[in-house]
């Protein structure tokens, strides 16, 4: 297992609709054809794999399970979007990148993006 640098923004504020997007960039030492990206959430004394995708370079990301994530790739960058977030989902979201094929296997883990989620205020009742 070889180490690899992964960069991601320090802070992102989710939209009022609970959508947060950030870029995860990795310094690929070679020409990987198969890449796995995992988003981990570290908060509330827990570590959670929020979503994971494996993709062939140049292809769409295919996320596993009932994923709340979507994403696209461009070169050594992955554009990640997490939806359906609520205030209690605020936390540190860490990008983990694995170069699966061809060998050797590389692993990189970012420092994390602190995502802040603010639940929208309910609209006041109106007489109109």
């Amino acid at each position: 297992c070889k180490a690899m640098h992964v960069a991601q923004p320090a802070v992102v504020l989710a939209s009022s609709r609970g959508i947060a997007s950030f870029v995860c960039e990795y310094a690929s030492p070679g020409k990987a054809t198969e890449v796995r990206v995992t988003v981990l959430r570290q908060a509330d004394s827990q570590v959670t794999e929020v979503c994971a995708a494996t993709y062939m370079m140049g292809n769409e990301l295919t996320f596993l399970d009932d994923s709340i994530c979507t994403g696209t790739s461009s070169g050594n960058q992955v554009n990640l979007t997490i939806q359906g977030l609520r205030a209690m989902d605020t936390g540190l979201y860490i990008c983990k990148v694995e170069l699966m094929y061809p060998p050797p296997y590389y692993l990189g883990i970012g420092n994390g993006t602190q995502i802040y989620v603010i639940d929208p205020e309910p609209c006041p009742d109106s007489d109109f």
């Epitope: 959430r41 908060a43 509330d44 827990q46 959670t48 794999e49 929020v50 979503c51 994971a52 596993l64 399970d65 009932d66 994923s67 709340i68 997490i82 359906g84 977030l85 209690m88 989902d89 936390g91």
Partner: nanobody, 125 residues
Framework: EVQLVESGGGLVQAGDSLRLSCAAS????????MGWFRQAPGKEREFVAA????????SYADSVYGRFTISRDNAKKMVYLQMSSLKPEDTDVYYC??????????????????WGQGTQVTVSS
């Protein structure tokens, strides 16, 4: 409806390993998020680990991260908790639970509808 039966608990020494198993019945097992929780007498039930319906995604309490591994076999309707480097503070009754709903950034807060009867794990120093 899902019925859950845990097994594999026992008395071990600190530093040892143990594997808990949870056998499920019910046709819809593969659609549930499965979790392990633990509880000591007089204390609140505590989240240990959870695994998504396909088994692709997991979640762990910080206190067990790197020491415990949760896994599942949907064909056999089984969930496992591999516990290693056990500590005296891991002593508890361990419960298997099944939760409905999509995977989320905080699976510990999902609604777990079905629970097993628990299995005792005792770690002596």
């Amino acid at each position: 409806e899902v019925q859950l039966v845990e097994s594999g608990g026992g008395l071990v020494q600190a530093g040892d390993s143990l594997r808990l198993s949870c056998a499920a019945s019910g046709r819809t097992f593969s659609s549930y998020v499965m979790g392990w929780f633990r509880q000591a007498p007089g204390k609140e039930r505590e989240f240990v680990a959870a695994i998504s319906s396909s088994g692709a995604l997991t979640s762990y309490a910080d206190s067990v991260y790197g020491r415990f591994t949760i896994s599942r076999d949907n064909a056999k309707k089984m969930v496992y908790l591999q516990m290693s480097s056990l500590k005296p503070e891991d002593t508890d009754v361990y419960y298997c639970a099944a939760g409905r709903g999509p995977w989320s950034p905080r699976p510990s807060l999902l609604t777990y509808d079905y629970w097993g009867q628990g299995t005792q794990v005792t770690v002596s120093s």
